[in-house]
Interface confidence: low
Amino acid sequence: DTHKSEVAHRFKDLGEEHFKGLVLVAFSQYLQQCPFEEHVKLVNEVTEFAKTCVADESAENCDKSLHTLFGDKLCTVATLRETYGEMADCCAKQEPERNECFLQHKDDNPNLPPLVRPEVDVMCTAFHDNEATFLKKYLYEVARRHPYFYAPELLFFAARYKAAFAECCQAADKAACLLPKLDELRDEGKASSAKQRLKCASLQKFGDRAFKAWAVARLSQKFPKAEFAEVSKLVTDLTKVHTECCHGDLLECADDRADLAKYMCENQDSISSKLKECCDKPLLEKSHCLAEVENDEMPADLPSLAADYVESKDVCKNYAEAKDVFLGMFLYEYARRHPDYSVMLLLRLAKAYEATLEKCCAAADPHECYAKVFDEFQPLVEEPQNLVKQNCELFEQLGEYKFQNALLVRYTKKVPQVSTPTLVEVSRNLGKVGAKCCKLPEAKRMPCAEDYLSVVLNRLCVLHEKTPVSEKVTKCCTESLVNRRPCFSALELDEAYVPKAFNAETFTFHADMCTLSEKEKQVKKQTALVELVKHKPKATKEQLKGVMDNFAAFVEKCCKADDKEACFAEEGPKFVAASQAALA
């Protein structure tokens, strides 16, 4: 349905508060280095303009597309060339090329200082003094650090952020009330950002067919009682929502997401029995709840898949007549029967089934050729099952920190060319899979673990794409979305790698080490571990463990000393010399 003024349409649909929030997020995700005040000014100008269009849709410029309006506004920033360099060249282009150009310049790893959390009293004062500015600042700071954050979901996080301050700034012990809530929001926010980044990578790098396949599998697991036509409708709508958000069309995305939530709640009976409690909530909470809803119970009387997809003499006929729909139905039927499989495994099975049909339907006796297709699935299923089993055993044996260290060593040996900060970040996050998934019952372990690993490895892929250094990483990241994790798992020690020269500076530590938080201390030690492996890629586990134990003892000793700096100065070179000897 067309509107005379798109901006007026979205303003009326979303309301002023959400409109302003989404425009601020959009601008902050495009111009990540711009100061807060500059963005607020731009948002206020756009909002005032939108109001004139609501009053009179025929007013000047009200008929322009949102990309034209927003792009024109972004291109008024005076310091564009100095701050962003070649991104300023986007402004010489016409739509839609200009928006594509802005999208290409989004930076997944912007050079921004880490967010420092002020004292609780300082935060509460700022919240009470100007609540609106305080919340806008939250949207701005998160959006510029996470340029693909799912915008309507970020509004939900901001609402929770506001609720936390409203409650805790009244509490007797403000810190005890507020800090756990902020930690939870931070951790959930990082996870949400990473999950959305994978959706956008899937759409942008592999196309909407890849995203739709992912969505068919996931929604069929969640809604196994829904008919195929219903799942197809939800997949189509969900693909539109995420395509819009990933493309920077945040107002359309939020509007369509609200419509999808409305549709799901109006059609609960044909979707899932689990939606009821979500549908009583206000919009932002409702959409979040629907996205996170647990899997419905599987229908009790599902027939065997073999009849339609193996035993039938018409498999090739049906496949030839409607390849994507036939494969979609296969994926739907397989996924609804297997909530215990990861989405990525289900997609691999569908890919294997497709490959078998492509081969067999051209054979002399197709039925004979594809009769054993389900047997070919067995190794594909066993591989992630074994991986999860082995890694959960290792996690239970070592605990999180040492499990992360094992992964750091493993991944540094696989791809030693990758930067140390990236290896530390990615391996630490890979290591979190243990605490997240290994405590779950068997039937939930694989979907939890493998689908989480896909999200973490996507982070490695987007960081590596910005600064490519390893052909192996490029290969695993670009060849197949569904086989990324098996591709990385299969990598061995890089024999072609020339070990990094030893640099004593890398292993020189100071008294400031003693004042770091436990997490920061771990990152320091893990950084040193990566550097050690880069220096000695063939070092054994025992050798590395010995060096790391000595390192921990050395730091502990110096942090207990009266003159800490003198201790580090004296003991540091001894530690370095001993380490070199141990690794010789």
Partner: nanobody
Framework: QVQLVESGGGLVQPGGSLRLSCAAS????????MSWVRQAPGKGPEWVSA????????RYAESVKGRFTISRDNAKKTLYLQMNSLKPEDTAVYYC????????GSQGTQVTVSS
């Protein structure tokens, strides 16, 4: 999105006739083979009849051969099932599917044969 909407069901006496229709949207109907499937109360789905994308090749379950006729109009994106000489055992929910699948993708239309 794929949508299949059946109509034409109802209550009919043994020996009577009905014509079912299935209106399709959301995919290129003319490129797809289609089927009719039925599910009687308390039973699993049973494949009834199929037709290829052009309408030339038709197949029937033994239980309906000679009584039922499947056809299609690709211009109208509609699948039909002409049911003659109906018997009480034909009582079921009838639904159309893409290809030869017995997976139900729509609400279906109730056919009741009873005196």
């Amino acid at each position: 999105q794929v949508q299949l909407v059946e109509s034409g069901g109802g209550l009919v006496q043994p020996g009577g006739s009905l014509r079912l229709s299935c209106a399709a949207s959301g995919f290129t109907f003319g490129r797809f083979g289609m089927s009719w499937v039925r599910q009687a109360p308390g039973k699993g789905p049973e494949w009834v009849s199929a037709i290829d994308s052009g309408g030339a090749d038709t197949r029937y379950a033994e239980s309906v051969k000679g009584r039922f006729t499947i056809s299609r109009d690709n211009a109208k994106k509609t699948l039909y099932l002409q049911m003659n000489s109906l018997k009480p055992e034909d009582t079921a929910v009838y639904y159309c599917t893409i290809g030869r699948s017995t997976s139900r993708g729509s609400q279906g239309t109730q056919v009741t044969v009873s005196s």
